[in-house]
């Protein structure tokens, strides 16, 4: 067989994500092998003929691949010996998601998992105080999202409290006609309070924080992928 | 950080046997090859064997089969190298060394064997 | 076997100066070769791996290059610190082999 030992080699896939317009990694790990040219990675699609991306002895083969991934593939080739067989896919798109297969085979044995790549657009808000309103407002912008979020508010102290009587939220298409951008303006905010603006889609979490007092303005914003 | 921490230095008689030790710290064991490398007197350095603690797959250097025998224990987080039937020839600074994130990028301190009659 | 050729065996050469060492494969070995530094009575240390990429904390005046058959260890300016023994290796195959050496010496 030119296998020793064992015929089922351990992969493993973690479930991501994929930013549209931005470069995304399908991370996948195995049992490393000692040798470069004992190593096979082939990535495929569920529902695509042809192969997404395959490596093997120690170069790229992409005589099968498909289009839809042409010049869009490469794995961490330096990573490869040490049981890395994660692919970097370039400029994702709306439609690179689905179901994927890392297929791992080395001199030790063979392997395979699968994995869920979720697109869409996510990004991080940004909240600013609105000094041209008649009442102090907070605005909160984040440039891409897709698809449509929902979006809330909340504050330290009022917690708890709805502020979807007090806000004002819209989706403005971008120019690819895919992404949104997101507005919310909150009206009557007080000083010494710190607000939450919370952005959340089935891909990613996104939350900005802005903490108002008489001297100073301090912000805070964090980004969760969500299932990955 | 990672550490590989090699046994200290044996003299031996021709025909006898030396079991080098390798404890390592500081990644997990059972994740990656281990390699023993020879480096004789003045010489350059000569791949011996792997193993891959996880599932003690070896992979041997055919010229140091029969020779040198290795194995690990993983609750201890050690590999040994076994060196049998030593000659002078065998006489030699053993080095342990792994591939956490690139190939041999940690090193034991080496174990030098010395065989003389 | 492959066979990796290193040459110079010794080369030498003064600080500030720089270095180029090679390191020939019998057979394409892809990407497959890293170098190493040893010095007396030291363990060999990770300089370059997969023929290009600088291993962490590494100097940046040491690069790598090459694919196939042929590498390049380039040393842009010699430190005195760099005055050692230089290996070449391959993880294309097994067994896995090392290079003869190159021994870089204060001129």
């Known amino acids: 067989f030119g296998i020793s030992g064992k015929h089922f080699i351990t992969v493993t896939t973690f479930t991501s994500a994929g930013n549209i317009g931005e470069d995304g990694t399908l991370s996948c790990t195995f049992e490393p092998d000692i040798k470069l040219n004992g190593i096979v990675i082939q990535w495929l699609k569920e529902g695509i003929k042809g192969l997404v991306h395959e490596f093997k002895e120690g170069k790229d083969d992409l005589s099968q691949q498909h289009e839809m991934f042409r010049g869009r593939t490469a794995v961490f080739a330096d990573q490869v010996v040490v049981g890395n067989a994660s692919l970097r896919l370039k400029n994702v798109q709306l439609t690179d998601a689905g179901t994927y297969t890392c297929y791992i085979r080395t001199s030790k044995g063979k392997g395979n998992a699968n994995l869920e790549y979720k697109t869409g657009a996510f990004s991080m808000p940004e909240i600013n105080v609105d000094y041209n309103a008649s009442s102090e407002s907070l605005r909160c912008e984040a440039p891409r999202w897709f698809p449509q979020p929902t979006v809330a508010w909340a504050s330290q102290v009022d917690q708890g409290a709805n502020f979807s009587e007090v806000s004002n939220t819209s989706f403005e298409l971008n120019s690819e006609n895919v992404t949104m951008k997101v507005v919310s303006v909150l009206y009557n905010v007080t000083i010494n309070n710190t607000y939450s603006c919370m952005i959340e889609n089935d891909i990613a979490k996104a939350t900005g924080d802005i903490k108002v007092t008489d001297s100073e303005v301090k912000r805070r914003s964090q980004l969760q992928l969500l299932n990955s | 950080q990672v550490q590989l921490v090699q046994s200290g230095a044996e003299v031996k008689k021709p025909g006898a046997s030396v079991k080098v030790s390798c404890k390592a710290s500081g990644y997990t064991f059972t994740s990656y090859w281990m390699h023993w490398v020879k480096q004789a007197p003045g010489q350059g350095l000569e791949w011996i064997a792997a193993?891959?603690?996880?599932?003690?797959?070896?992979d041997y250097n055919q010229k140091f089969k029969g020779k040198a025998k290795i194995t690990a224990v993983t609750s201890t987080s050690t590999a040994y190298m076994e060196l049998s039937s030593l000659r002078s020839e065998d006489t030699a600074v053993y080095y342990c060394?792994?591939?956490?994130?690139?190939?041999?990028?940690?090193w034991g301190q080496g174990t030098m064997v010395t065989v003389s009659s | 076997e492959i066979v990796l050729t290193q040459s110079p065996a010794t080369l030498s050469l003064s600080p500030g100066e720089r270095a180029t060492l090679s390191c020939k494969a019998s057979q394409d070995v892809s990407f497959a070769v890293a170098w190493y530094q040893q010095k007396p009575g030291q363990a060999p240390r990770l300089l370059i791996s997969s023929a290009s990429y600088r291993y962490t904390g590494v100097p940046d005046r040491f690069s790598g290059s090459g694919s196939g058959t042929d590498f390049t260890l380039t040393i842009s300016s010699l430190e005195p610190e760099d005055f050692a023994v230089y290996y070449c290796q391959q993880h294309y195959n097994t067994p896995l082999t090392f290079g003869g050496g190159t021994k870089v010496e204060i001129k």
């Open positions: 060394t792994t591939t956490v994130a690139h190939y041999f990028d940690y």
């Open positions: 193993i891959y603690p996880g599932n003690s797959d070896t």
